[in-house]
Interface confidence: low
Amino acid sequence: ECVTQLLKDTCFEGGDITTVFTPSAKYCQVVCTYHPRCLLFTFTAESPSEDPTRWFTCVLKDSVTETLPRVNRTAAISGYSFKQCSHQISACNKDIYVDLDMKGINYNSSVAKSAQECQERCTDDVHCHFFTYATRQFPSLEHRNICLLKHTQTGTPTRITKLDKVVSGFSLKSCALSNLACIRDIFPNTVFADSNIDSVMAPDAFVCGRICTHHPGCLFFTFFSQEWPKESQRNLCLLKTSESGLPSTRIKKSKALSGFSLQSCRHSIPVFCHSSFYHDTDFLGEELDIVAAKSHEACQKLCTNAVRCQFFTYTPAQASCNEGKGKCYLKLSSNGSPTKILHGRGGISGYTLRLCKMDNECTTKIKPRIVGGTASVRGEWPWQVTLHTTSPTQRHLCGGSIIGNQWILTAAHCFYGVESPKILRVYSGILNQSEIKEDTSFFGVQEIIIHDQYKMAESGYDIALLKLETTVNYTDSQRPICLPSKGDRNVIYTDCWVTGWGYRKLRDKIQNTLQKAKIPLVTNEECQKRYRGHKITHKMICAGYREGGKDACKGDSGGPLSCKHNEVWHLVGITSWGEGCAQRERPGVYTNVVEYVDWILEKTQAV
């Protein structure tokens, strides 16, 4: 059962797992949600009736029954983790806490103009978990405007105390706002020989990398595969750190793999969601329950539905035993990972999918592409929307992309002459324009947000957001696309597609069926050569074949240039402008979305 409200002056008795410090009950609930075992918590607020050393304590709790006895206590605030809920969860915390000193290891001290600048510095520093900033009213003159960057083993403060004229806050890495590079490569036959902060068992290097990504202290990892010669270290995932933030030594070792935390791009990759099945693999851990199940998929569903289950092992039925049902072992451990992994026993193992909601919806795998052909099939581009105007008559105006449950990203030039959002309709999950009838459901537009530096498509800033009047319920045919990571600026995308209902040639009409075309990206230098009369800026990205023949065209404007990278689709460009359509040596010019991520997040996350 999902309980989101907080219980004031209430304390849960017993069930303590650990105590951390958080600046608010709301953040305590987030910490509880992300902890592998926490189901309930009690937070102690600042209060004259309470011992100051207990202020801001956040006691994480677990219970076999999923609840605990309640006791009245002034200043205590209790609640439940969001693990029990189905809604999307984010660790992003933009709050600034006034007159609070969040303690940790102060490893960097520098002058900053504002708390915002201090927070940005923390966000762009690989080690920083949170910061404290002494404001210009701070009593000690020489320490005014000092920005202290801090980290701890847990990622949460070691203590929180009242301190006048300082402000504290958290790194915004989990808000997708870090400029740190995102190194997605996994290096085979490599051991990083640096300090281990923790070690867990993992079935493969990908799971190891995901665990590293959501571990607060892990910057890179080494994974020993099941073929590793030292038996006691097989399937061992070593979580590592270093002062510089990079591995100091790489050792060539067969059957080991190493890689980096994907913290700075975690909003566009699955981090918590380990959806694969591991055949002939047994996960050991504390047994929660043993239930009969028809298949390993059914066993995974049972694990996902049991709030305390973290992973499972399914043993298929022997011949015709038990109506063909096998045994499903639901398991848990203190850190959410198996305590040991065994091979060759015939089990099929995997993880709960309950934590998938902690990942961005946009990372969910969608239907495989249909190779060849130009017409799309249903569900192939679930983020693509058709934007209609109803004035003077209803017609397709532009394309757009779902980037959040209330947000469409499109091109600013689409709104030339559009006086009011009232005349706009957004249709999602559409394959054929002919599906749109009088009674077809649509999303009304509450607000059009055009970039304030936009003048015309050719001069850039051709980007706009539509805030919808109601929220989109994600399904297989309508779901968001990931924004590119700022840390991914140097990624070379090789699998890019432009989609839309636009013209197929310059003098044509809007197409009925959503069209798709695979188009290679072109460097900005190359693009500039093709458009000597224009300035191709770094805020633009170009795509097209030298010989022409495939391109976006009139009516595709505002739609996505979608690129697949590491199994996840990213909105790399917004169809903006070009000379003609599909002309030789005239690539299409798109708004370079990565350069506007800050702008998008600022507008969509504004309170």
Epitope: D101, I105, E142, T152, Q153, D198
Partner: antibody, heavy 122, light 107 residues
Framework: EVQLQESGPGLVKPSETLSLTCAVS?????????WGWIRQPPGKGLEWIGS???????YYNPSLKSRVTISVDTSKNQFSLKLSSVTAADTAVYYC???????????????WGQGTLVTVSS | DIQMTQSPSSLSASVGDRVTITCQAS??????LNWYQQKPGKAPKLLIY???NLETGVPSRFSGSGSGTDFTFTISSLQPEDIATYYC?????????FGGGTKVEIK
């Protein structure tokens, strides 16, 4: 009650490596806390050498960093100090200590060993 | 590194006297300061943490105050068993640093 006990040679030759071990009883190192080394030259004040977490994360005093290695062996419930290229200036009583709080902040040294005198002399 | 300057380096007082030791930090360290007592031939013992909090089991005649750069350690009524050297220690920034110590003797 947590107890710490330093052990190692009392005499080390100049340019050699000083090696000390701190055996912990009454508490499992792997359960948390920072575990540190502090030294005190005869008749002088205290100097923090460095600290280590159960997981292997280390923090060292920059003045000694190039010569110091602190490691932990959770299976033996002990942690160790190695100080290379020693000189007479490294003659001191070496203490091992445990922090007051389990969270990862080197703050207060609450539990101390009784100390062991290491003399650097040829 | 943050320098911790303790004064006086030694003092002599009578039993029952009020004894005050000061510790000055080279930069603002908020209240991230501890006080230790070290008796001859023994390891230091934590008395005060966070500038003013008394460690469990420590007699109430010991107290600490201050914030920022200036801190004070007080023994309200000196007892014979208080003969020791007292050290302050900051944990605001790494490396952890200690004051030079104040040796307290009885007249």
């Amino acid at each position: 009650e947590v107890q710490l006990q330093e052990s190692g040679p009392g005499l080390v030759k100049p340019s050699e490596t000083l090696s000390l071990t701190c055996a912990v009883s009454g508490y499992s190192i792997s359960s948390g806390y920072f575990w540190g080394w502090i030294r005190q030259p005869p008749g002088k004040g205290l100097e923090w050498i460095g600290s280590i977490l159960h997981s292997g994360v280390t923090y060292y005093n920059p003045s000694l960093k190039s010569r110091v290695t602190i490691s932990v062996d959770t299976s033996k419930n002990q942690f160790s100090l190695k100080l290379s290229s020693v000189t007479a200036a490294d003659t001191a009583v070496y203490y091992c200590a445990r922090d007051r709080t389990t969270v990862s902040m080197i703050e207060y040294f609450q539990h101390w060993g009784q100390g062991t005198l290491v003399t650097v002399s040829s | 590194d943050i320098q911790m300057t303790q004064s006086p380096s030694s003092l002599s007082a009578s039993v029952g006297d009020r004894v005050t030791i000061t510790c000055q930090a080279s930069q603002d360290i908020s209240n991230y300061l501890n006080w230790y007592q070290q008796k001859p031939g023994k390891a230091p013992k934590l008395l005060i943490y966070d500038a003013s909090n008394l460690e469990t089991g420590v007699p109430s005649r010991f107290s600490g105050s201050g914030s920022g750069t200036d801190f004070t350690f007080t023994i309200s009524s000196l007892q014979p068993e208080d003969i020791a050297t007292y050290y302050c220690q900051q944990f605001h920034l790494l490396p952890i640093t200690f004051g030079g110590g104040t040796k307290v003797e009885i007249k």
